[in-house]
């Protein structure tokens, strides 16, 4: 029986050219996390494997940095980065937990309505 819950950063608004941290936290379970996958729609961004460490997809290696923790840092944001991001926790013995984050990257003119890099 899967008892765990994932809390995510939820919605994030950020300015074009800035950077942002995507984070998920798995709680309420004693299951062991064997791997965390970060995906954007159907594209794999990165994998953090408990034994093998981090692997960043080649097409994202210039703009994606591992961490902090099991999170992921996106850099040099473009408007095209707007979208849904998923953290997929593979655990034993529970199975898979998935969290969803929605990122919107704003043009400077709109971003001026809020803080410089993160605009919730």
């Amino acid at each position: 029986m899967m008892t765990g819950t994932i809390e995510t950063t939820g919605n994030i608004s950020a300015e074009k050219g800035g950077s942002i941290i995507l984070q998920c936290h798995l709680s309420s379970t004693t299951a062991q996390v064997t791997q965390v996958n970060w995906e954007q729609q159907d594209q794999l961004l990165a994998i953090c494997n408990a034994d093998l460490g981090w692997h960043i997809s080649p097409s994202f290696k210039d703009r994606v940095a591992p961490g902090p923790g099991l999170g992921l840092t996106l850099q040099s944001l473009t408007v095209n980065d707007t979208g849904e991001y998923f953290c997929i926790y593979h655990t034993y013995p529970d199975g898979t937990y998935t969290g969803r984050i929605f990122l919107e990257v704003l043009e400077s003119s709109v971003a001026e309505h809020g803080a410089r890099f993160q605009i919730p």
């Epitope: 950063t9 939820g10 408007v79 707007t82 043009e107 993160q118």
Partner: antibody, heavy 119, light 108 residues
Framework: EVQLVETGGGLVQPKGSLNLSCAAS????????MNWVRQAPGKGLEWVAR??????????YYADSVKDRFTISRDDSQSMLYLQMNNLKTEDTAMYYC??????????WGQGTLVTVSA | ENVLTQSPAIMSASPGEKVTMTCRAS???????LHWYQQKSGASPKLWIY???KLASGVPARFSGSGSGTSYSLTISSVEAEDAATYYC?????????FGGGTKLEIK
């Protein structure tokens, strides 16, 4: 999993008051902008109010139709969103949805709570 | 306030048909800030298409969105029974954020 659960709707007389609540879970509530969106019976969607995060000084924004009558607020320690509605009019009758958003996109919706203003 | 006008208000289609609904704004909207929502009878709205053309997770590939300036559209290449719903466009060009009046899609 993100959950938004609205409560507090009901029947109220014109010029009366009502306080709606929304309990949020599954995401970091205190960094998220939150909104109320309403829908009159058989009608379309209308954005009502928004409150931004502490890092944005809890800035609030309102539709002209509710300005000076409705007040949006939040309690980050409890992951709660509120809408205090005063001087209610019959045209405020609607389903009220609690909605999490980015700057421009309404991405997380609650199930809604029905407010009926009638004599 | 930027007023969004959706047409038609109601449309009917048979399974397999291609359908297009439009959303016109009273003043120009950035394509990055024009979004669509689906609402089925008795349910809450769901984000369906964002930034004009990106499909939200779980949305079938038969849906597409396009447009720029003051004219935007949502197209279903081959309608299925489960697509029966009301579709709303929504924009941001400063406050207030506004929605269109909706297009109700009925399946014959």
């Amino acid at each position: 999993e993100v959950q938004l659960v609205e409560t507090g709707g009901g029947l109220v007389q014109p010029k009366g008051s009502l306080n709606l609540s929304c309990a949020a879970s599954g995401f970091t509530f205190n960094t998220n902008a939150m909104n109320w969106v309403r829908q009159a019976p058989g009608k379309g969607l209308e954005w009502v109010a928004r409150i931004r995060s502490k890092s944005n000084n809890y800035a609030t924004y309102y539709a002209d139709s509710v300005k000076d009558r409705f007040t949006i607020s939040r309690d980050d320690s409890q992951s709660m969103l509120y809408l205090q509605m005063n001087n209610l009019k019959t045209e405020d009758t609607a389903m009220y949805y609690c909605v999490g958003s980015t700057m421009t996109i309404f991405s997380y919706w609650g199930q809604g709570t029905l407010v009926t203003v009638s004599a | 306030e930027n007023v969004l006008t959706q047409s038609p208000a109601i449309m009917s289609a048979s399974p397999g048909e291609k359908v297009t609904m439009t959303c016109r704004a009273s003043s120009s909207v950035s394509s990055s800030y024009l979004h669509w929502y689906q609402q089925k009878s008795g349910a809450s709205p769901k984000l369906w298409i964002y930034t004009t053309s990106k499909l939200a997770s779980g949305v079938p590939a038969r849906f597409s969105g396009s447009g720029s300036g003051t004219s935007y559209s949502l197209t279903i290449s081959s309608v299925e029974a489960e697509d029966a719903a009301t579709y709303y466009c929504q924009q941001y060009s400063g406050y207030p954020l506004t929605f269109g009046g909706g297009t109700k899609l009925e399946i014959k």
